[in-house]
Interface confidence: low
């Protein structure tokens, strides 16, 4: 079927690139031969000029970008809100368990409280950060922790009667604490729950911000001169004959988008497992691999590994006594 | 104390929270967070359609364009397109992926490798060093009473402390621990743990 | 790239008012607590206001107590010095610093700075 | 508030030899939980200040080896084994133990 003969002086097409490209003169008065046209090739005279066919070509890709953006938004907005979420309901984790922990010290152990707060504020703050993906090794936290409080729990409870100048002992104490494994299995049991958990957590972020970067790079992707064509010829060139309002045929218009999405279309395999091994991941995130559930009951493992130490207080005093004895007689001196 | 509020009482390891409970857990968002990413499992092979069926698309019309003509919507050259004497729509496909596409394919890749290992089997939540160590030596509920992390006698029991987001009613962060917080007739020396 | 970009230094008459502003980019700035450090003409670097990463416990030297406002808004990644009652003694280079908590005050990122006159 | 004090107010130096800076506190940096909270920085002409060492000998993440601190109590001490020209500019020791924190007066590294 031939096609019908074009608008004798472009008028309709005139008006219509007018909206896409306001005053600029591109436009033939009526229909010519188009010999020059690269993307729309005419059967006939045309309505359009190689420039015209350029800034359809520019519109063509644009839009296609703005369609994919829309796919998208609904997926992008559901995995951004909630990596803000759960980034924000980790952070109250860790904020209340440092708060449980606090409280826990100041009933029970008042005489700690100064500097316990110090040390539980600097452990959960490195939970914190490790959880953001900071690269600072668990054990160590844990560590640090028990090195710190050791040497309180000494000077306070255990050997009250040191002056408090003596602060040379605290290296030496700080030794003594994993020597003579002074908390007992607690540290080693801490380090396994809380490194366990936090791993899962972190990489449980790390995935949802993936998935952010994924969206935004198919968001923002630059489509090819030959997908801009093929999007020209198949949302523009009918113009060019004054067809202004026909539209794609629909098999058509799938054969132009898998050609135009070939690239992104290879996500879809790594994008599948992605979801599947995230539910995976979320299937296995309870008990002590449950930050909220480890975190939250620190306070109790901590007090479990104070109480003891105070059950070993004697025989710790004396061993402590002997193996720190030059620290304090420097001190006292 | 002015630091502690009354409804946090912790003694002999019992602890009793005064909070309205929310329903909502944290793993029961992350269950419905990945309920709500299944039901886009397909999304990108389904991005080709989604998009025709976006744009303008002839569907109750008769005639349509098919790149080079006005065709009927159901005729042989509908499917067709007059891309013949243009360029190879098979070369398009061969080109690959973009630069862009094949990196965040890589980190795709990688991540899913890490989730995979992350991954906990099933029935394997516990390791037996763990419970040698007396992690969970309690009779303790799957869902709703979780035991934590204690061994010896006092077993603690924590209802799900955190109801999603459920800021408490107090805050104690360390920051305002005593010695920590400005009164009026505090010293500054009496800050212990400003940068702590 | 860790960036701390300050603006709002200015000329101010003494007894005036000026606002500061850092804005915090490339890092997780919600967790890190951050503090304003000035540095006079002759050089001195003097630590002039602390705030925690929540934004609620700041801390001040007795030189600005009651004078200067540390504040930040997380979900702007943004810190501010709200200056007040200037006094010539005021005048300095503003730098917005991190604290990096893991090394208890040590300030591994400062911003290039801003300048405050404060003269008649 | 805790003072310190350092020494040399300026070090003139050739390249290639070490220089040495002495930072030294008005009372014990030691903090109770057995950490020292002395840290040194380093400012460039027309530059802000950049975080050298933390914790009395901890170098900074791309300081290089050359740069190193020690000491503890009251007397501390920054060592540059081989000054090169990059190095030139102003030291300030600042230590966060006690509250408030408080910074040394500078020492400037220049060319002989």
């Known amino acids: 079927q031939p096609p019908p003969p074009p608008d004798a002086t472009c008028h309709q097409v005139r008006s219509f690139f007018q909206r896409l490209q306001p005053g600029l003169k591109w436009v033939p008065e009526t229909p010519v031969p188009g010999s020059d046209l690269q993307v729309c090739l005419p059967k006939g005279p045309t309505c359009c000029s190689r420039k015209m066919e350029e800034k359809y070509q520019l519109t063509a890709r644009l839009n296609m970008e703005q369609l994919l953006q829309s796919a998208s938004m609904e997926l992008k907005f559901l995995i951004i809100q909630n990596a803000a979420v759960f980034q924000e309901a980790f952070e109250i984790v860790v904020r209340h368990a440092k708060n449980y922990t606090n409280a826990m010290f100041k009933n029970n152990y008042p005489s700690l409280t100064p500097q316990a707060f110090e040390f539980v504020g600097e452990f959960f703050t490195d939970v914190s950060l490790y959880i953001l993906g900071s690269d600072i090794n668990v054990d160590d936290m844990v560590n640090e922790l028990f090195d710190s409080l050791f040497p309180v729990i000494y000077t306070q409870m255990m050997n009250p009667g040191l002056p408090e100048s003596v602060l040379d002992i605290n290296e030496c104490l700080r030794g003594a604490r994993r020597d003579l494994k002074v908390f007992g299995s607690f540290p080693k049991l801490i380090m396994t729950q809380v490194s366990k958990s936090l791993q899962v957590t972190r990489i449980f972020l790390q995935a949802l911000n993936l998935g952010i970067e994924v969206i935004n790079t198919t968001d923002h992707l630059k489509f090819s001169k030959d997908c801009g064509r093929m999007l020209t010829r198949m949302w523009y060139c009918s113009y060019c004959q004054g067809l202004m309002m026909v539209k794609p045929c629909g098999g058509y218009c799938n054969v132009v988008m898998q050609g135009c999405m070939a690239g992104v279309v290879e996500i879809d395999k790594y994008w599948r497992e992605y979801i599947l091994s995230l539910e995976e991941l979320v299937n296995g995130m309870y008990r002590i691999y449950d930050m909220e559930n480890v975190l939250l009951g620190l306070f109790s493992t901590i007090h479990d590994s104070i109480q003891y130490v105070q059950k070993n207080g004697g025989k710790l005093t004396t061993t402590i006594g002997k193996l720190c004895a030059h620290s304090q007689q420097r001190q006292y001196r | 104390s002015a630091y502690y509020p009354e409804d946090l009482f912790i003694d002999k390891k019992i602890l009793k929270v005064a909070h309205v409970e929310h329903e909502e857990t944290l793993s029961s968002r992350r269950r419905e967070l990945i309920q709500k990413l299944k039901s886009f499992i397909n999304f990108y092979s389904a991005l080709p359609g989604y998009i025709c069926s976006h744009s303008p698309v002839a569907e109750n019309d008769t005639l349509c364009w098919n790149g080079q003509e006005l065709v009927e919507r159901y005729s042989q050259k509908a499917a067709r397109n007059g891309m013949k004497n243009q360029f190879n729509l098979h070369e398009l496909k061969m080109k690959g992926p973009e630069p862009v596409v094949s990196q965040i394919i890589d980190k795709l890749k990688h991540i899913n490798q890490l989730l995979r290992t992350m991954s906990v089997p099933k029935g394997k939540v516990l390791d037996k060093s763990l419970d040698e160590e007396g992690l969970e030596s309690g009779d303790c509920g799957d869902d709703e009473d979780e035991c934590i992390g204690s061994s010896g006698d006092g077993m603690v029991k924590v209802k799900n402390q955190l109801r999603f987001l459920a800021e408490l009613a107090y805050d104690l962060d360390v920051d305002d621990a005593p010695g920590n917080k400005q009164h009026g007739n505090q010293k500054d020396n009496e800050i212990t743990t400003s940068h702590s | 790239e860790v960036q701390l970009v300050e603006s709002g230094g200015d000329l101010v008459k003494p007894g005036g008012s000026l606002k500061l502003s850092c804005a915090a980019s490339?890092?997780?700035?919600?967790?890190?607590?951050m503090s304003w450090v000035r540095q006079t003409p002759e050089k001195r670097l003097e630590w002039v206001a602390y705030?925690?990463?929540?934004?609620?416990?700041?801390y001040y030297p007795q030189t600005v107590k009651g004078r200067f406002t540390i504040s930040r808004d997380n979900a702007k990644n943004t810190l501010y010095l709200q200056m007040s009652s200037l006094k010539s003694e005021d005048t300095a280079m503003y730098y917005c610093?991190?604290?990096?908590?893991?090394?208890?005050?040590?300030?591994?990122?400062w911003g290039q700075g801003a300048s405050v006159t404060v003269s008649s | 508030d805790v003072v310190l004090t350092q020494s040399p107010l300026s070090q003139p130096v050739s390249l290639g030899d070490q220089a040495s800076i002495s930072c030294t506190s008005s009372?014990?940096?030691?903090?109770?939980?057995?950490?020292?909270?002395l840290h040194w920085y380093l400012q460039k002409p027309g530059q802000s200040p950049k975080l050298l060492i933390y914790?009395?000998?901890n170098r900074f993440s791309g300081v290089p080896d050359r740069f190193s601190g020690s000491g503890s109590g009251t007397d501390f001490t920054l060592k540059i084994s081989r000054v090169e020209a990059e190095d030139l500019g102003v030291y300030f020791c600042?230590?966060?133990?006690?509250?408030?924190?408080?910074f040394g007066g500078g020492t400037k590294l220049e060319i002989k």
């Open positions: 610093a991190r604290q990096n908590i893991a090394r208890r005050g040590a300030m591994d990122f």
């Open positions: 490339g890092f997780a700035f919600g967790t890190y607590d």
């Open positions: 705030i925690s990463s929540g934004g609620n416990s700041p």
């Open positions: 009372q014990s940096l030691l903090h109770s939980n057995g950490n020292t909270y």
């Open positions: 914790k009395v000998s």
């Open positions: 600042s230590q966060s133990t006690h509250v408030p924190p408080t």
